[in-house]
Interface confidence: low
């Protein structure tokens, strides 16, 4: 029986050229976290493995930094970074838990004026 829940930073916005922290937190379960995958759609960004530590996919090495904690920091943001991000917690014995974050990267002038967005 999977009892855990994932809390995420939800829908977030950041400005072009800036950085953002993606955070997920798994609670309400005693399952052991063996690994956390960070994915954009089903493209792998990074992995934090309990035994092997962090691995950042080569294509994202220049713009992705591990942490804080099990989170992920995206740097030098571009408008193309807008989209869905998933934290996938691999646990034993529960299996997998997935959290979703939507990031919108705004042009600097738009972000400065406090633009907000909605997910339909």
């Amino acid at each position: 029986m999977m009892t855990g829940t994932i809390e995420t930073t939800g829908n977030i916005s950041a400005e072009k050229g800036g950085s953002i922290i993606l955070q997920c937190h798994l609670s309400s379960t005693t399952a052991q976290v063996t690994q956390v995958n960070w994915e954009q759609q089903d493209q792998l960004l990074a992995i934090c493995n309990a035994d092997l530590g962090w691995h950042i996919s080569p294509s994202f090495k220049d713009r992705v930094a591990p942490g804080p904690g099990l989170g992920l920091t995206l740097q030098s943001l571009t408008v193309n970074d807008t989209g869905e991000y998933f934290c996938i917690y691999h646990t034993y014995p529960d299996g997998t838990y997935t959290g979703r974050i939507f990031l919108e990267v705004l042009e600097s002038s738009v972000a400065e004026h406090g633009a907000r967005f909605q997910i339909p």
Epitope: M1, M2, Q32, T34, Q35, N37, D42, L44, I47, N49, A50, D51, L52, H55, S57, F86, I88, H90, T91, Y92, P93, D94, G95, T96, Y97, T98
Partner: antibody, heavy 126, light 107 residues
Framework: EVQLVESGGGLVQPGGSLRLSCAAS????????MSWVRQAPGKCMEWIGN????????NYAPSLKNRFTISRDNAKNSLYLQMNSLRAEDTATYYC???????????????????WGQGTMVTVSS | DIQMTQSPSSLSASVGDRVTITCRTS??????LRWFQQKPGKAPKLLIH???NLANGVPSRFSGSGSGTDFTLTISSLQPEDFATYYC?????????FGCGTKLEIK
């Protein structure tokens, strides 16, 4: 582009053996769990088993583990399926599939195949 | 083993129809479910991962829902290229198990 190309299929007599190969390209083979899945004509898809990225750990469907062995050669970017004591019911298309990056053996998502080859047909008949 | 009950086994529908395929598991698997599409002579293609997440490059008319033991794949408006066989796969427990497929045919 991820490519998985299976080979080694064909006609084999009951009781015989066959070794299937899967040539992988377009990704770092040694970073990924790999699996074999089969599909018999008119039957359900069946997961055969998987192998950890470094070859040190395997899982099998209980009904097949005594006859089938999965191995890999990371230097050759190749995955293998050794099938012994073949039976008519092993007639199927065999697919090589790739899972996610370096998932630990406790994580079931490792073999939840993301990429598939085109398959190779194995016919067991006298 | 976790048993997968996929229904219906076959379905006739027309272009533009809304179609729903269900997969029921014999025990709670959380969201550890994937949906695949397979066309004759082709390799299966991943549509949905984590029960609800659209795989990269998959049209938004496909959606997945459910958790625990009951899961649904919905195609909101069928297109000609959607006529194929659809499979669910659980990856919460070894051995991994598939549903037996739903063949979607043109009415």
């Amino acid at each position: 582009e991820v490519q998985l190309v299976e080979s080694g299929g064909g006609l084999v007599q009951p009781g015989g053996s066959l070794r299937l190969s899967c040539a992988a390209s377009g990704f770092t083979f040694s970073d990924h769990w790999m699996s074999w899945v089969r599909q018999a004509p008119g039957k359900c898809m069946e997961w055969i088993g998987n192998i950890q990225y470094d070859g040190s750990y395997t899982n099998y469907a209980p009904s097949l583990k005594n006859r089938f062995t999965i191995s890999r050669d990371n230097a050759k970017n190749s995955l293998y399926l050794q099938m012994n004591s073949l039976r008519a019911e092993d007639t199927a298309t065999y697919y090589c599939t790739r899972g996610h990056f370096r998932i630990t053996m406790a994580s079931m998502g490792a073999s939840a195949s993301v990429y598939w080859g085109q398959g190779t047909m194995v016919t067991v008949s006298s | 083993d976790i048993q997968m009950t996929q229904s219906p086994s076959s379905l006739s529908a027309s272009v533009g129809d809304r179609v729903t395929i269900t997969c029921r598991t014999s025990q709670d698997i959380g969201n550890s479910l994937r949906w695949f599409q397979q066309k004759p002579g082709k390799a299966p293609k991943l549509l949905i991962h984590g029960a609800t997440n659209l795989a990269n490059g998959v049209p938004s008319r496909f959606s997945g829902s459910g958790s625990g033991t009951d899961f649904t794949l919905t195609i909101s408006s069928l297109q000609p290229e959607d006529f194929a066989t659809y499979y669910c796969l659980q990856h919460n427990e070894y051995p991994l198990t598939f549903g037996c497929g739903t063949k979607l045919e043109i009415k």
